[in-house]
């Protein structure tokens, strides 16, 4: 079993990067003298007790930032946040930390990432950019839900 | 406010099933893990299992499996223990309890009032 | 399976600091055991105390606190008050399941 979590860069279709501003992240068109974030992801290792053929549940992290992405109601509706967590602490829990936890699924070379707190509830960018990562379950031109991501060895 | 409130007292015979409900209120089942446990008179607690709500998938411990079955009804907030196969040491108080991560931890946060279950021929 | 083995009964004075142990027969108990530690008190229902071996529940107060002692996982009251008379319950994760001693009766007096 892998126990140390892996890296990678990750961009949307429109080659749009992850960027950290005031605790936000946002995705806004690759630019040089940028510094897109470095996610880093790790397997949940209580994998038999989530739901099968979803996807592989991760933690998602900002490497090094000891940042991880979190789901949360906000009134009646599911957001998308920041929180100060180090992913190894989640990984070591004894019970998956839903909360934390992403379906990931691969088609090709496109990535999604569903909530597992929120089943239906994709990370996703406005297709106009220079927006904050969001939670939608519209899954249409409005957002943008599918991302490449890379890993880095 | 948060509360679990378990059936009432049950009297069974050797050989017989029981099922004990715990009916959740002031929050969803669904985003929580429920734990079922054990205290034989005069013993300590024995964990049983525990049970995902929002999916189903459940954990026992090796001593329970095949003795225990974990199930939940979401649309009424309510979870249920059954046993099978009733021995005069099943005898015991069983309590639900609710699992629940908050801020770094899990932690065992609410309790039902226990369910007294005797078994005697 | 493992056994986890608490003290049977402890007696503190009212305003004085005890200590409860949980120990391990598999050897010293870790982080990685993530020690719970719950409290019951006469008639009434079973209230978590400590999660993740040191962090407090929301709501516990301060003068309960969790934490790893010569190899045992270790609730300690500081400043105990009449209240605090109950039995205590600690349990331990291995791998994928959950061990809980047998429980120590607190009398404060």
């Known amino acids: 079993k892998i126990d140390t979590p892996q890296r990678g860069s990750i961009q949307d279709i429109n080659h749009r990067v992850w960027v950290l501003q005031d605790q936000t992240l946002i995705a806004v068109p690759r630019k040089d003298r940028m510094s897109p974030v470095t996610i880093a992801l790790i397997s949940c290792r209580h994998v038999e007790t989530l739901e099968k053929d979803r996807g592989n549940p991760i933690y998602l992290g900002l490497n090094g930032l000891n940042l991880c992405l979190m789901c949360a109601k906000v009134g009646d509706q599911p957001t998308l946040q920041l929180k100060e967590k180090d992913i190894m602490d989640l990984y070591n829990q004894p019970e998956p930390v839903k909360s934390f936890l992403f379906y990931h699924s691969q088609s090709g070379r496109n990535s999604t990432f569903e909530s597992v707190a929120f089943p239906g509830w994709f990370i996703a960018v406005s297709s106009e950019g220079g927006c904050p990562l969001i939670l939608t379950q519209e899954l249409g031109k409005a957002n943008t839900t599918d991302f490449g991501l890379t890993m880095l060895f | 406010q948060v509360q679990l409130v378990q059936s009432g007292a049950e009297v069974k015979k050797p050989g017989a099933s029981v099922k004990v409900s715990c009916k959740a209120s002031g929050f969803n089942i669904k985003d929580t893990y429920i734990y079922w446990v054990r205290q034989a008179p005069g013993q300590g607690l024995e964990w049983i299992g525990r049970i995902d709500p929002a999916i189903g998938t459940t954990r026992y411990d090796p001593k329970f499996q095949g003795k225990a079955t974990l199930t939940t009804d979401t649309s009424t907030n309510t979870a249920y223990l059954e046993l099978s196969s009733l021995r005069s040491e099943d005898t015991a108080v069983y309590y639900c309890?609710?699992?629940?991560?908050?801020?770094?931890?899990?932690?065992?946060?609410?309790w039902g009032q226990g369910t007294l279950v005797t078994v005697s021929s | 399976q493992a056994v986890v083995t608490q003290e049977p009964s402890l007696t503190v004075s009212p305003g004085g600091t005890v200590t409860l142990t949980c120990r391990s027969s598999?050897?010293?108990?870790?982080?990685?055991?993530?020690a719970n530690w719950v409290q019951q008190k006469p008639g009434q229902a079973f209230t978590g105390l400590i999660g993740g071996t040191n962090d407090r529940a929301p709501g516990v107060p301060a003068r309960f606190s969790g934490s790893l002692l010569g190899g045992k996982a270790a609730l300690t009251i500081s400043g105990a008050q009449p209240e605090d008379e109950a039995d205590y319950f600690c349990a331990l994760w291995y791998s994928n399941h959950l061990v809980f001693g047998g429980g120590t009766k607190l009398t404060v007096l």
């Open positions: 598999t050897g010293a108990v870790t982080t990685s055991n993530y």
């Open positions: 309890a609710r699992y629940d991560y908050s801020g770094s931890s899990f932690y065992f946060d609410y």
